[in-house]
């Protein structure tokens, strides 16, 4: 077969091959950041001629072209500035109100290098109707001037942008409208991934989170977040898989389905799991009426088992048969459960769509998504019932409008975006499914994306201040009591003083508490043991604050999970009828366990706790000990079973001031507290310059840096006396 | 917040002894870190010694182990540097300085003494 010609370069860009020079290869070109290809990609055709898709004259020069953003067509009671046919990146445009108007969304917006500009629709309104004045986006037009319930208006864009969201919108009955903002954009226009990974977020967890069905609220505006226990979540997976996905980025596809696999499991919800590839056939790979659809390894398994090549034969993109077979196995479920049952009546399903194109066989995809409304009777009152996302990928051929026409349209949500490439793909699905915004106390979620902070990595991550300087850390096990350690407080019992620092959103210090109550274990004497020629003894080493008001649960505090709890049991997602042993056997299943504590500069240090033989050969290292314990015969009379060992080869060491904050695992994308640090033999923050500054141990160094933990696991009675009403524990 | 005198330091011939005392006041000496610094003309303060608030476990700087000794009587309220072997390096001014964490970071103490020169010549 004859190849396509080589002189295919464009100015001031690169272009990549799906595959090579042959018949069928789809190349791509790229720009720098604030340029855009034209045309965007070309096909190689099997009479060996480039055609470039949607052109009707001959085959022009590539060239990159700048970047503009939408000027404002139409701004009403106020006026804008510079008044511009389009803005280039980097410029301004500042909105102003007329008296009697006040100004709502962003005073000044700033065109980024994606063609959208930055902040929200700026809007003049003089809080007259029903429903607050809808505005117009940049580069929109709109019909329809009266915000009273039941009017209507109606968005279209100018010259050649596309709109994305809703084009006619009503106000609801309860002052809100309905559908999603319209925004008018560049064809080539597309989304950063830092702003899909919050958008799709967002309204993932407003879904996860919908309203518990059990529980009768009236209708709040859009809607409220709360984790649904009970609930039942059918996720069902599309990949495209047709001609112009390169196998790499099919791979990619894969990876980032597999990420939202792995996130999804993690909530406390029942979730079933559908996979389904296309090209001109879809192909089900799993499906919710498999028992299988429901086990994370399972469905990862047959996401891994996913082939590039099960599509060879037909290459097209049939977005109507991949939505189509959602339906069918929807049309199954329903059969099975009895339409009218409330099995299947409070299934939630979301469909996720990754494509890289336009369809392009089969039908309009919307007729599909219209036979999976009707099956799943949506309407106002089940809105919350489905969700379908559709996300672009690699703003070649994709179709805007046809992405916007699937997307679900829902208030303050957003569901149909299209990315750059599947490197952001990635990010995004790395990124989304943040719970650590929900409000309430769900344990052991820290944000994991690259750009979080530490203490958004380690919310639960508390300081303890007996005067002015820090002197311990602690660890939020719920949202009013601390777990930290004893030897913290040797000034007799005046807590006055003393102050807990809890992360706080608003404030890069966080919030000081005061504590309410210490509980310290009445076990623990540093003297227990002098007689014995131990000059301090950490057994029982530790103790709870209850703080004099409740910590409000954000993105910077919010509890880890205590093993041995019901909590902790949702987010392992172990059966019902676990004991706190199979909590130790899940958590502490190795002879070493990768495990973290974290440091006076927040961040999060390695470690690994040695279990069984390697116990006994990481605490007989205290035996070299001189100074603190002089003649030393038995090293069980210092390292009692109530301690775990760490500091062996490449482990961190603690310093003093980390003392009573929590050691844990990660399992699940959930965080485990199942030691607090108490006691070392090596301290490498000691005459340092600041919080920032370590010294290893020297390889000569004797003994040897060791470091003890008081082990959760070994103090479940005395936790268990005192939150008992705090916490749900599991039984022994 | 704990007050803190030092107070022995003084003239001294290479591989002679000095003790340097510190005296602390406020009920609380028993319940902090209590460690030892010095500093050497055109240099950075570093740490020399410290001792655990039981009086249990010590640390040393390197350059003084084997030859200096920190101890505390907590009934005096009295923080102590043995200081043996003394070497022309060893010439500084020493300031004693208390911490309840134990780990006494430069940037974080807020309990220091005035000083006292140590000099070390023949």
């Known amino acids: 077969a004859p190849s396509c010609p080589q002189n295919v370069n464009i100015s001031g860009g690169t272009f990549t091959l799906s595959h090579g020079w042959a018949p069928g290869s789809l190349l791509t070109y790229s720009c720098p950041q604030g340029l855009y290809p034209s045309p965007a990609s070309r096909l190689c055709k099997s009479s060996g001629q480039w055609q470039t898709p949607g052109a009707t004259r001959s085959l022009s020069k590539a060239v990159c072209k700048p970047v503009r953003c939408p000027a404002p067509v139409s701004f009403e009671n106020g006026i804008y500035t510079p008044r511009l046919g389009s803005y280039p990146v980097g410029g301004n445009v500042s909105f102003e109100c007329e008296d009697g108007f006040i100004l709502r969304g962003s005073p000044v917006r700033q065109c980024r290098p994606n063609g959208m500009w930055d902040g929200e629709t700026a809007v003049c309104d003089n809080g007259a109707g029903h429903c607050p004045n809808p505005g117009i986006s940049l580069g929109a037009v709109r019909t329809g001037f009266r915000f009273g319930h039941g009017d209507k208006v109606r968005y279209r864009c100018s010259s050649n942008l596309v709109l994305t969201g809703s084009s006619e919108r009503e106000c609801q009955g309860n002052g809100v409208w309905s559908g999603t903002e319209p925004i008018c954009r560049q064809p080539y226009s597309y989304d950063f991934p830092e702003d899909v990974a919050p958008a799709l977020g967002t309204s993932f967890s407003h879904m996860l989170g919908a309203t518990n069905p059990t529980q009768k609220t009236k209708e709040s505006l859009g809607r409220k977040i709360q984790i649904q226990r009970s609930g039942h979540l059918n996720l069902y997976l599309l990949l495209d898989c047709s001609q112009s996905v390169s196998e790499n980025d099919f791979l990619i596809f894969k990876e980032s389905a597999s990420l939202m696999v792995d996130r999804i499991f993690s909530f406390e919800i029942n979730v079933s799991v559908a996979i389904i590839t296309f090209a001109s056939e879809p192909k089900v790979l799993m499906s919710v009426l498999n028992d299988n659809s429901r086990d994370m390894t399972e469905v990862i398994s047959s996401l891994e088992n996913a082939n590039y090549k099960d599509h060879e034969n037909g290459t097209g993109t049939n977005t109507y048969a991949a939505l189509n077979s959602v339906y069918l196995m929807m049309n199954n479920q329903m059969r099975l459960l009895g339409m009218e049952t409330m099995a299947w009546q409070e299934i939630r399903h979301a469909i996720i769509l990754l494509t890289d194109g336009k369809s392009n066989m089969g039908g309009s995809p919307k007729t599909a998504v219209d036979h999976i409304r009707e099956i799943l009777n949506i309407n106002q009152k089940r809105n919350d019932y489905l969700d379908i996302y559709a996300i672009g990928v690699g703003k070649l051929d994709v179709d805007w409008r046809e992405l916007n026409e699937l997307g679900s349209k829902k208030d303050g949500e957003r569901h149909a975006f299209i990315l750059q490439d599947t490197k952001a793909l990635h990010q995004v699905f790395e990124h989304m499914l943040d719970v650590s915004k929900l409000t309430d106390t769900i344990c052991g979620v820290g944000n994991m994306s690259a750009n979080a902070s530490d203490q958004e990595r380690t919310p639960w991550h508390v300081t303890i201040k007996p005067k002015s300087q820090e002197t311990c850390r602690g660890a939020l096990i719920s949202d009013q009591w601390v777990l930290t350690a004893a030897h913290c407080f040797r000034d007799g019992n005046d807590h006055s003083l003393w102050r807990v620092n809890v992360g706080d959103p608003k404030s890069q210090w966080g919030k000081e508490f005061l504590i309410e109550k210490a509980v310290i274990s009445p076990g623990f004497d540093v003297f227990a043991k002098k007689n014995q020629g131990i000059l301090e003894f950490y057994g029982d080493d530790i103790a709870l604050l209850k703080l004099a008001q409740k910590v409000k649960m954000s993105t910077h505090a919010r509890p880890i999970c205590l093993p041995c709890t019901m909590e902790a049991n949702l987010a392992l997602r172990r059966p019902q009828g676990s004991t706190c042993r199979d909590h130790e056997n899940e958590l502490l299943n190795k002879q070493s366990v990768p495990a973290h504590f974290v440091a006076l500069n927040g961040s999060k240090l390695n470690i690994n706790l040695k279990m069984g033989v390697e116990w006994t050969s990481c605490a007989e290292v205290v035996s070299q000990e001189k100074t603190m314990f002089p003649n030393l015969t038995d090293v069980r009379e210092v390292v009692t079973d109530q301690f775990l060992c760490s500091g062996t080869q490449e482990d961190e060491s603690p310093c003093k001031g980390e003392s009573g904050g929590a050691v844990f695992l990660e399992r699940r994308f959930r965080f485990f507290q199942v030691g607090l640090v108490s006691w070392g033999l090596y301290n490498p923050c000691l005459g340092s310059a600041d919080k920032n500054s370590r010294k290893r141990a020297p390889r000569s160094k004797v003994p040897p840096p060791r470091d003890f933990h008081i082990n959760l696991f070994r103090m479940q009675p005395w936790l268990r006396q005192h939150l008992g009403d705090v916490l749900n524990f599991l039984p022994l | 917040q704990v007050q803190l005198v030092e107070s022995g330091g003084g003239l001294v011939q290479p591989g002679g002894s000095l003790r340097l005392s510190c005296a602390a006041s406020?009920?609380?000496?028993?319940?902090?870190?209590m460690g030892w610094f010095r500093q050497a003309p055109g240099k950075e303060r570093e740490f020399v010694a410290s001792i655990s608030w039981t009086g249990g476990s010590t640390e040393y700087a390197d350059s003084v182990k084997g030859r200096f000794t920190i101890s505390r009587d907590n009934s005096k309220n009295t923080l102590y540097l043995q200081m043996n072997s003394l070497r022309a390096e060893d010439t500084a001014v020493y300031y004693c300085a208390a911490d309840y964490s134990g780990d006494f970071l430069l940037s974080d103490l807020d309990s220091w003494g005035q000083g006292t020169l140590v000099t070390v010549s023949s």
């Open positions: 406020g009920h609380t000496f028993r319940s902090y870190y």
